[in-house]
Interface confidence: medium
């Protein structure tokens, strides 16, 4: 499994992982105590046939070509959690591992 | 976690799981000894903002709105394996569990 990494200067048109810092403060999300910002990354780019396909299933659906199947799209294929400190709805402070907050790899699925 | 299930008569335009039988015989993939066909399913439909979003990350990227982020797309969010009997490149018969061959759930990511 591998995926492409790009940045804002890249000319890559294919599915790629780009850097993105999410800033909770800028969103006005004050219930998040920490972190105030974190590196989330995101996926963007074209999914030519077979390029970076995560699953054999993606290839099979392309082969079978059913009505309405739009072809694969560039989406996270590996994600990781971050630890966060935040207020829940009852205004209790919670410290927890929040899954799937960081994109580690992008692929076509 | 939940996802919509549709069939060929559905009028649902949103991200949905549709039935699809993959027929290896019809593809001429005779190196696959068994199964000759299986229920693979596929994902299709529109991803309106927040509908069926699998990850908080999806929402955050939408909020941050970086250059080139295309918005979420309808993609498998839960997949399961099938057992297969096939010839490898050395013409040895292999029996194994092949991951991510069946779409169990679709969502927007």
């Amino acid at each position: 499994d591998f995926g492409l990494d790009c940045d804002e200067h890249s000319t890559e048109s294919r599915c790629c992982r780009y850097p993105l810092t999410v800033d909770f403060e800028a969103f006005g999300w004050d219930w998040i105590i920490a972190p105030k910002r974190y590196k989330a990354n995101y996926c963007s780019g074209e999914c030519e046939f077979v390029f970076l396909q995560k699953y054999p299933h993606t290839h099979l659906v392309h082969q079978a070509n059913p009505r309405g199947s739009a072809g694969p799209c560039c989406t996270p294929t590996k994600m990781s959690p971050i630890n966060m400190l935040y207020f829940n709805g009852k205004e209790q402070i919670i410290y927890g591992k929040i899954p799937a907050m960081v994109v580690d790899r992008c692929g076509c699925s | 976690d939940f996802g919509l299930d549709c069939d060929e008569h559905s009028t649902e335009s949103r991200c949905c799981r549709y039935p699809l039988t993959v027929d290896f015989e019809a593809f001429g993939w005779d190196w696959i000894i068994a199964p000759k066909r299986y229920k693979a399913n596929y994902c299709s439909g529109e991803c309106e903002f927040v509908f069926l979003q699998k990850y908080p990350h999806t929402h955050l990227v939408h909020q941050a709105n970086p250059r080139g982020s295309a918005g979420p797309c309808c993609t498998p969010t839960k997949m399961s394996p099938i057992n297969m009997l096939y010839f490898n490149g050395k013409e040895q018969i292999i029996y194994g569990k092949i991951p991510a061959m069946v779409v169990d759930r679709c969502g927007c990511s």
């Epitope: - | 290896f24 005779d30 696959i32 000894i33 068994a34 057992n83 010839f87 029996y95």
Partner: antibody, heavy 124, light 107 residues
Amino acid sequence: QVQLVQSGAEVKKPGASVKISCKASGYSFTGYFMHWVRQAPGQGLEWIGNIYPYNGVSNYNQRFKAKATLTVDKSTSTAYMELRSLRSDDTAVYYCARRYYYGTGPADWYYDVWGQGTLVTVSS
Amino acid sequence: DIQMTQSPSSLSASVGDRVTITCKASQDINSYLSWFQQKPGKAPKSLIYRANRLVDGVPSKFSGSGSGQDYTLTISSLQPEDFATYYCLQSDEFPLTFGQGTKLEIK
């Protein structure tokens, strides 16, 4: 429907060879194992071997390794078995049979279709 | 090679009888056992696979059971068309091996 049609009866002299055929129809020939089984007069069934037509990969009963050669012609969907150095005790009915996979395990098979059999008589 | 011992080698029974044929393997065959019926001058016909599963189109009067080394075929109510020779086959290991057959005759 799925059918296996075998070639007609043969009479051969000891030491000769014979090639019998099994023509498949009604299914994708290359994707199913073809097995061969023999039955001597008044006797039981004996497994000779099998072949996967897609790539010609075959397995033989050690007892028949020097006796039988299994081949296929994909263009005509036909399986062949050649028997060499014939002796009188090779006199038998020879059957081809398709092996069908029904399950999820490595040995989940059964014979779903048989040929009608080819009688090979070896006599001087 | 795995040896398959079938018993009895012949059996006389009457129409309406219930009969049982047994097959013993020389080692555990993990239920990879099939049963066949053969009539004179005809190819064998598959009845049961995986020890107890009925082949499509085979009447339910035929049933199979067993595990490990010991297996049985039962015909619940014999009809005239059931008088034939029956064979078992193990497919757990190459070479595949058949039992020597049980000839079922009308009494």
